[in-house]
């Protein structure tokens, strides 16, 4: 029951996380700025991964997509790639984890197969979360670095003239959404990996064999084949191993973890 709960919770947390990563990737507010430091006019510029916008205090907004690939900053391309890889891995992970859920029965899928699928999806969620966190962090670092580069370059040129507008860049909402979403996906992945351990059947390093002492009820033929037993008729004429050992599958189809040697 605890395993099912852990797996189910891991799935839900990851689902929310991946939805958040998709939302963050699509959002325009990755960085925001108060253009020309002019609070009276309150015109804001904000950038996303796909376009940048200018918004008036009245709410009117004008956006422009990044129509070039060659002119894009390399780091922006890298962040895009990280976020897309995160989404793709997360989506595949979700697909795999749906079939891995213990509460869902698909044909005669064994627990070992479900355990493997749970582990696979868990790892995918972890990598997906890390990609999102890395992407958002790279973007945030880029904002901070370029802000200081602009500030350091502020008084250059002839006569110490101001050569840049001191624009206030702030982290946009998408950065926080991305960090939280990446974290949730990561946590969900860890939970799936933990659930996998509980799902995996306990394997032993030996073949389960029951030994029975030879008594009056066991007769032997010279050819080394069992003639009859006290446990039922020997229709299969099975080979006796270790001179008195009876293979487990004579009575049961599959070895059980409750068999004792």
């Amino acid at each position: 029951m605890a395993v099912t709960a852990c797996q189910g919770l891991g799935f839900v947390v990851s689902l929310i996380g991946i939805a958040g990563i998709i939302a963050a990737t699509c959002m325009d507010q990755w960085s925001t700025q108060d253009l020309y430091n002019n609070p009276v006019t309150a015109v804001f510029n904000y950038q996303g991964l796909w376009r940048s916008c200018v918004r008036e205090s009245s709410g009117f907004t004008e956006c422009r997509g990044y129509f070039t690939l060659l002119g894009l900053p390399a780091m922006l391309q890298a962040v895009r790639a990280l976020m897309i890889v995160g989404i793709v891995l997360g989506a595949i992970g979700l697909l795999v984890s749906i079939f891995a859920l213990k509460c869902i029965r698909i044909g005669s899928m064994e627990d070992s197969a479900k355990a493997n699928m749970t582990l696979t999806s868990g790892i995918m969620f972890i990598v997906s979360g890390l990609c999102a966190i890395a992407g958002v962090s790279v973007f945030a670092n880029m904002l901070v670095t370029n802000f200081w580069m602009s500030t350091a370059n502020m008084y250059t040129g002839m006569g110490g003239m101001v050569q840049t507008v001191q624009t206030r860049y702030t982290f946009g909402a998408a950065l926080f959404v991305g960090w939280v979403a990446g974290g949730l996906t990561l946590i969900g992945g860890v939970m799936m990996c933990i659930a996998c351990r509980g799902l995996a059947p306990e394997e032993t390093n030996y073949k389960a064999v029951s030994y029975h002492a030879s008594g009056h009820s066991v007769a032997y033929k010279p050819g080394g084949f069992k003639a009859s037993t006290g446990f039922g008729s020997n229709t299969k004429n099975k080979k006796i191993y270790d001179g008195g050992a009876r293979t487990e599958d004579e009575v049961q189809s599959y070895p059980s973890k409750h068999d004792y040697v």
């Epitope: 960085s31 700025q33 253009l35 015109v43 510029n45 950038q47 940048s52 200018v54 008036e56 009117f60 004008e62 422009r64 990044y66 002119g71 894009l72 900053p73 780091m75 922006l76 973007f139 880029m142 904002l143 370029n146 802000f147 580069m149 602009s150 370059n153 840049t164 507008v165 624009t167 860049y169």
Partner: nanobody
Framework: QVQLVESGGGVVQTGGSLRLTCEIS????????MGWFRQAPGKEREFVAA????????WYADSVKGRFTISRDNAKNTVYLQMNSLKPEDTAVYYC???????????????WGQGTQVTVSS
């Protein structure tokens, strides 16, 4: 290399008009939010007016509202500042400014022209 060249400055009487022009080369004008700044002798450079990429959003400093009009022609890679009802306090060197679309994501994030002198005599 992106370059901004201003023109149209000169000496004008109080109440007169001037039209400043800023031409951008080395880049598509539509990728930049364009602005005009001015610097009077012994003073800091101050914001005058700005216009968004498509020209649908414009904003002005309080001191020039109703007198100055900023416009752009992306096809000609040119930005204009129409200055009417000029006052002596409008005397300054006027600079054209281009703020890149990527903002802080790229470096350099903005470009400046060399400036054009506007003198309003009383």
């Amino acid at each position: 290399q992106v370059q901004l060249v201003e023109s149209g400055g000169g000496v004008v009487q109080t109440g007169g008009s001037l039209r400043l022009t800023c031409e951008i080369s080395g880049a598509a004008l539509s990728s930049y939010t364009m602005g005009w700044f001015r610097q009077a002798p012994g003073k800091e450079r101050e914001f005058v007016a700005a216009i968004s990429w498509g020209g649908s959003i414009t904003w002005y400093a309080d001191s020039v509202k109703g007198r100055f009009t900023i416009s752009r022609d992306n096809a000609k890679n040119t930005v204009y500042l129409q200055m009417n009802s000029l006052k002596p306090e409008d005397t300054a060197v006027y600079y054209c400014h281009a703020e890149g679309q990527f903002g802080a994501l790229s470096y350099p994030k903005d470009y400046w022209g060399q400036g054009t002198q506007v003198t309003v005599s009383s």
